[in-house]
């Protein structure tokens, strides 16, 4: 769920999760266009991960799962079901992805009308 996403990003990364709430074309609710930088690519990948999970019948935004933050690393589990495992992996991936990026202030509160209608395909 959203709480876990914020928690995992905060666990691994050097920045508050709030820094990604309205960033580039993909960080925040929804998203379309060409990702603007490495952070935006992380968010695009996470959108793809959530979409795959949704297609499998999971509810990414609302399903809770268990995880631990150990030495700035996300440890998933114990999972009660496959969705919890999948969603924790999605959030773990974006947390690790974002932790390796540089922050470009010019993409914070980026105007959505500048984002193209078409998006890169998911892997």
């Amino acid at each position: 769920g959203i709480l876990e996403l914020a928690g995992t990003v905060g666990c691994v990364g050097p920045r508050t999760p709030i820094a990604y709430m309205k960033y580039g074309c993909f960080c925040g609710l929804g998203g379309h266009g060409q990702p603007r930088d490495a952070i935006d690519w992380c968010c695009h990948g996470h959108d793809c991960c959530y979409t795959r999970a949704e297609e499998a019948g999971c509810s990414p935004k609302t399903e809770r799962y268990s995880w631990q933050c150990v030495n700035q690393s996300v440890l998933c589990g114990p999972a009660e079901n496959k969705c919890q495992e999948l969603l924790c992996k999605c959030d773990q991936e974006i947390a690790n992805c974002l932790a390796q990026t540089e922050y470009n202030l010019k993409y914070l509160f980026y105007p959505q009308f500048l984002c193209e209608p078409d998006s890169p395909k998911c892997d």
Epitope: R52, A53, E55, A56, G57, C58, S59, E63, E80, N81, K82, C83, E85, L86
Partner: antibody
């Protein structure tokens, strides 16, 4: 159209090994999010979940039965297998193969009946 | 394991009636409850998933509701082809577990 069909020995003697095969069509077990599971139902009783296997080869076994069950798959042949060694009369039941998603059973096979009798 | 308590175990109704079946989970299963129909000698069929979502091709007279531990399955305007056994299944926590079933008969 998704179909699943179970095949098994029908009758076994106590201490023999049960080998079940599920042959399916209409989906691939290489598809993200899909799994195949086994359920059994003794006559006049409720269903019991045995085991399932996912597209990514992750396997789940019902804990009390874990040491006695083996589930495997051959996605190229669209088949899933379940073995239970050393059966006894408590294993007499109808065994169903199912297509599953993470939270529910989407499709069931017709079932295969096993009788364990000395 | 999560226990699923389904009631009633049997039910007599007339054509055109509205019938209701309940399923109670021993712990919170959020919305992860499914309902199935099984006719004698036939394969069980998924009717409803995620508590209230109709599976493809299922008539709209079937409906489901509930969340947490209490769930309800309803058939409005009972048809002859609805005579069957109905059972619920929780999908919150493995192993999947099932209700004991409700055998629906005509009065």
């Amino acid at each position: 159209q998704v179909t699943l069909k179970e095949s098994g020995p029908g009758i076994l003697h106590p201490s023999q090994t049960l080998s079940l095969t599920c042959s399916f069509s209409g989906f691939s077990l290489n598809t993200f999010g899909l799994g195949v599971g086994w359920v059994r139902q003794p006559s006049g009783k409720g269903q019991e979940w045995l085991a399932h296997i996912w597209w990514d080869d992750d396997r789940y076994y019902n804990p009390p039965l874990k040491s006695r069950l083996t589930i495997s798959k051959d996605p190229s042949k669209n088949q899933v297998f379940l073995t239970i060694p050393n059966v006894n009369t408590a294993n007499t039941a109808t065994y169903y193969c199912t297509q599953i998603l993470p939270h529910w059973v989407a499709y069931w096979g017709q079932g295969t009946t096993l009788t364990v009798s000395s | 394991d999560i226990q699923m308590n389904q009631s009633p175990s049997s039910l007599s109704a007339s054509l055109g009636d509205t019938i209701t079946i309940s399923c109670h989970a021993s712990q919170n299963i959020n919305v992860w409850l499914s309902w199935y129909q099984q006719k004698p000698g036939n394969i069980p069929k998924l009717l409803i998933y995620k508590a209230s979502n109709l599976h493809t091709g299922v008539p709209s007279r079937f409906s489901g509701s509930g969340s947490g531990t209490g769930f309800t399955f309803t058939i409005s305007s009972l048809q002859p082809e609805d005579i069957a056994t109905y059972f619920c299944q929780q999908g919150q926590s493995y192993p999947f577990t099932f209700g004991g079933g409700t055998k629906l008969e005509l009065k």
